[in-house]
Amino acid sequence: TRDVREPPALKYGIVLDAGSSHTSMFIYKWPADKENDTGIVGQHSSCDVPGGGISSYADNPSGASQSLVGCLEQALQDVPKERHAGTPLYLGATAGMRLLNLTNPEASTSVLMAVTHTLTQYPFDFRGARILSGQEEGVFGWVTANYLLENFIKYGWVGRWFRPRKGTLGAMDLGGASTQITFETTSPAEDRASEVQLHLYGQHYRVYTHSFLCYGRDQVLQRLLASALQTHGFHPCWPRGFSTQVLLGDVYQSPCTMAQRPQNFNSSARVSLSGSSDPHLCRDLVSGLFSFSSCPFSRCSFNGVFQPPVAGNFVAFSAFFYTVDFLRTSMGLPVATLQQLEAAAVNVCNQTWAQLQARVPGQRARLADYCAGAMFVQQLLSRGYGFDERAFGGVIFQKKAADTAVGWALGYMLNLTNLIPADPPGLRKGTDFS
């Protein structure tokens, strides 16, 4: 007999991604004997928390924690019982909670405390509930994308780890309340707040990142609604034949629409707003979200924010993917070039409500908002971030890679798994019949 290596045990980690519109739970797993102090982490399972994001529970913090129970109970079953105590559990909240923290810090604290109280009741190794900064959200999304697409380290056919020669991918995330752009850059950032130095697998990376609060899809829609009320009295991005009653208090309650709030407005007043299917006016309305008037640096993206020229390939995920997927799959429109993306947005914006409903069977939820969403994505990429046709050719729209959701959660987990000691592989006496 001789010593035979047992297959390494699996370790698990849980991340609750508390976004502005909803919360998702991701359970990750990796072999306990990790390579280079970073685990070979993949998604084990996931769970969508029903209802809105935790920031929507400002008036009912205990409701936020109660809403998580179903997914936490699922985690008890998805993670083997003997691994519960050693499984780290994190909750990271993003832009929805950043906004709540700006407007009502007490409510934000109460929600996090309520959630913390519930999470500590579970047998996992709870390691905190916190609000991620925009910079963290961007960087961890970048780490996730490059980790999953094996741009940091790869297992070769000869059974050895090597570093691929290809460069890293940039990452673009469009959430409900903010959007992030992150990519590797060679030159130092003119704005130190936009630069992050990372050391991964013994390699050094200089990364540019910026998060634009209030430029997430849901907040953009609210801002466009406020602009439409202010300037038109109709909504050029909504389809003709679609109309709805809008309560002014709802439109102006977000800090993102504060600048458009009329001095004296009746918050309980209701306004009937109709769509006009006007792509050109819609484009103008969306353009108003971006300011290019001043830049204190050698170059900017928009709103005076420093950004080096976009370089290399990019992966665009979350609402970037869903918007493009809608255009491609539901509308059957080509979106391989910037010109095609613009034409697709114009196509959607030209449709009447009846045409749109007929074109998209099963009446997709909030169908009326897809025009504005498509127009915003097109403008953000081309005018905002400065993608030209050549650079846009290097953008892939993806929601998953290697059966794992692309988003900040895995990157967050990867960063934190470095704190988890690796078990040595189990050695036992056995007969080797080879």
């Epitope: 909803h22 029903p50 209802g51 008036d59 709805t244 997709r364 939820a365």
Partner: antibody
Framework: EVQLVQSGAEVKKPGESLKISCKAS????????MDWVRQMPGKGLEWMGD????????TYNQQFKGQVTISADKSIRTAYLQWSSLKASDTAMYYC??????????????????WGQGTLVTVSS | DIQLTQSPSSLSASVGDRVTITCSAS?????IHWFQQKPGKAPKLLIY???NLASGVPSRFSGSGSGTFFTLTISSLQPEDFATYFC?????????FGQGTKVEIK
Amino acid sequence: EVQLVQSGAEVKKPGESLKISCKASGYTFTDYNMDWVRQMPGKGLEWMGDINPKYDISTYNQQFKGQVTISADKSIRTAYLQWSSLKASDTAMYYCARRGFFLYYGINYYYFDVWGQGTLVTVSS
Amino acid sequence: DIQLTQSPSSLSASVGDRVTITCSASSSVSYIHWFQQKPGKAPKLLIYSTSNLASGVPSRFSGSGSGTFFTLTISSLQPEDFATYFCHQWSSYPWTFGQGTKVEIK
């Protein structure tokens, strides 16, 4: 055709136990949560809780936690609502409802798409 | 908990009338669903996610709104529409219903 068939009306005395059922057909039972909704005489609707039959996980409205137990038997595609000790205030119509969903921007949004015919529970001494 | 307040609590109308029922939420919600309930029957889904007509529901029913204010409109009331209507939210735990609006024959 998707159908939810509930057990018949029950008349019970305070302190007695009861288990009512909801049998599903026409769809994959484990793909959807099953919820229970109470309607007291002449009143509105109240969500009580649900069961995820795939994982056998029950969640409850805090108002009903400890008062009722929700369970399911996958093998016979049936969800249950039970009381260990009934009170007169439990007199109501109880509905099971399938939790349907639609996907919007990668998020599942839920609604009750199919309902059982209801089980009337009368608790009286 | 999010309170849903329906207005009016009851109304009398004639066949052919246009009827509007409102549902006001105590906090902003993403969506509202509407149900119709006839005496002795289970509720039936009419509209999901604010404005989407459920399968088999006539086009005279429509829904709209956002945030904290939502409406259900019946463009031309038919004899079979006399019933009680409930709004329902699934944005904030626990999921709640409005108190109902009874539509009666004038």
